[in-house]
């Protein structure tokens, strides 16, 4: 590597490759300063002058240390059936994911392309697999013993209460009622409630620590590469 | 969501190889510098090697220069591994990290594979 | 190359303390200057990055500070969940080095 005192543009030493936060310009042929993120190269260097970098205009990111002539526009708005848990600056880009009660049917890179509602199960049926930020509900129906008497995309099959006496026996939809004015045992105290699907507004408002990813572009190299071997073609 | 898996690690005899391999997922690999970051048992991390988003640029720490190769296959979205001439010392769990801005600073790790260079 | 120390190399603590790790780099590092959590037996998680800059969807009670060859990590109000070595890394030149990190514990 060239000396650390080197300044930017310098020319590398042969097999060597530039710096941290530099870049090889092709056409200098020379260790160019790359732009920070939020910005881009609004002049490309030269053998005697560095990048000239400038900020990212509205709606408008980059994320990596970089040389592109543009920055990178942000994703649309999120839609009605979705939150906005990373806005649009000019070091990231926007992540829509689907609100509280929806999951992601068509996911990209980052966020979610197309949400849908997350299935309710009728009456007579409960859940058998709970909704996730990727999948949605699967419902099953009531096995004898059992009961759901709700439209719900949480609730699961409750068993029959316990009668001393039955006097009107419980189905798939409906608990057993009992003559008595108390059961001697009650399985089912009150609804039971699957946990909230992965998709829930308290992890919207706190994402996960990963940066939004900016497309795949080629001039997006985190290092510049050694100068050319003879015969090879440039970026 | 991000997500970095490595594979390869294993017991191997001092002189011997071992390829690691880490499956990426869950974002652009091809966009991002890849990193290769070691433990010893009961050390500190000691970063290991870089590769660019293309592939084409790579550094090495001291001790493992011109014995480890880092490479990538952005058409697999996997990162290597390749160790040669193994010595006890190197002897770790051996992390894939991705450089979230390109400027060495690695936002995202894998679970870690033990080598164990013994005889 | 970079040596980056650390220190202390240990310290124990109260829950809802202040705690300060500090890192020194052997040159100017600028800012390029990052702090990762490892609890046992899992990855490094990056917490701060260039210095001062809070990595998304970490605690707002971590922070950092501090440029050129000084910088100062700080938990403003320890929780259980901070049981961790703590360690500082150099970004600014290649190759690429850590500190020797800071194991934190409960009292």
């Known amino acids: 590597l060239p000396a650390q005192v080197a300044f930017t543009p310098y020319a590398p030493e042969p097999g060597s490759t530039c710096r941290l936060r530099e870049y090889y310009d092709q056409t200098a042929q020379m260790c160019c300063s790359k732009c920070s993120p939020g910005q881009h190269a609004k002049v490309f260097c030269t053998k005697t002058s560095d990048t000239v970098c400038d900020s990212c205009e509205d709606s408008t990111y980059t994320q990596l240390w970089n040389w592109v002539p543009e920055c990178l526009s942000c994703g649309s708005r999120c839609s009605s059936d979705q939150v906005e848990t990373q806005a649009c600056t000019r070091e990231q880009n926007r992540i829509c994911t689907c609100r509280p009660g929806w999951y992601c049917a068509l996911s990209k890179q980052e966020g979610c392309r197309l949400c849908a509602p997350l299935r309710k199960c009728r009456p007579g049926f409960g859940v058998a697999r709970p909704g996730t930020e990727t999948s949605d509900v699967v419902c099953k129906p009531c096995a004898p013993g059992t009961f759901s008497n709700t439209t719900s995309s949480t609730d699961i099959c409750r068993p029959h209460q316990i009668c001393n006496v039955v006097a009107i026996p419980g189905n798939a939809s409906m608990d057993a009622v009992c003559t008595s004015t108390s059961p001697t045992r009650s399985m089912a105290p009150g609804a039971v409630h699957l946990p909230q699907p992965v998709s829930t507004r308290s992890q919207h408002t706190q994402p996960t620590p990963e940066p939004s990813t900016a497309p795949s572009t080629s001039f997006l190299l985190p290092m510049g590469p050694s100068p050319p071997a003879e015969g090879s073609t440039g970026d | 969501q991000v997500q970095l898996l490595e594979s390869g690690g294993g017991l191997v005899q001092p002189g011997g190889s071992l390829r690691l391999s880490c499956a990426a997922s869950g974002f652009t690999f091809s966009t991002y510098a890849m990193s290769w970051v070691r433990q010893a048992p009961g050390k500190g991390l000691e970063w290991v090697s870089i590769?660019?988003?293309?592939?084409?640029?790579?550094f090495y720490a001291d001790s493992v220069k011109g014995r480890f190769t880092i490479s990538r296959d952005n058409s697999k979205n996997t990162l290597y591994l390749q160790m040669n001439s193994l010595r006890a010392e190197d002897t770790a769990v051996y992390y894939c990290?991705?450089?979230?801005?390109?400027?060495?600073?690695?936002?995202?790790w894998g679970q870690g594979t033990l080598v164990t260079v013994s005889s | 190359d970079i040596q980056m120390t650390q220190s202390p190399s240990s310290l124990s603590a109260s829950v809802g303390d202040r705690v300060t790790i500090t890192c020194q780099a052997s040159?100017?590092?600028?800012?390029?200057l990052n702090w990762y959590q490892q609890k046992p037996g899992k990855a490094p998680k990056l917490l701060i990055y260039?210095?001062?800059t809070l990595q998304t969807g970490v605690p707002s009670r971590f922070s950092g500070s501090g440029s050129g060859t000084d910088f100062t990590f700080t938990i403003s109000s320890l929780q259980p969940e901070d049981i961790a070595t703590y360690y500082c890394?150099?970004?600014?030149?290649?190759?690429?080095?850590f500190g020797q990190g800071t194991k934190v514990e409960i009292k």
């Open positions: 040159q100017d590092i600028t800012n390029f």
């Open positions: 260039d210095a001062s």
């Open positions: 990290a991705r450089d979230g801005t390109s400027a060495a600073a690695f936002d995202s």
């Open positions: 890394q150099q970004s600014d030149s290649y190759p690429i080095t």
């Open positions: 590769i660019s988003d293309g592939g084409d640029a790579t």
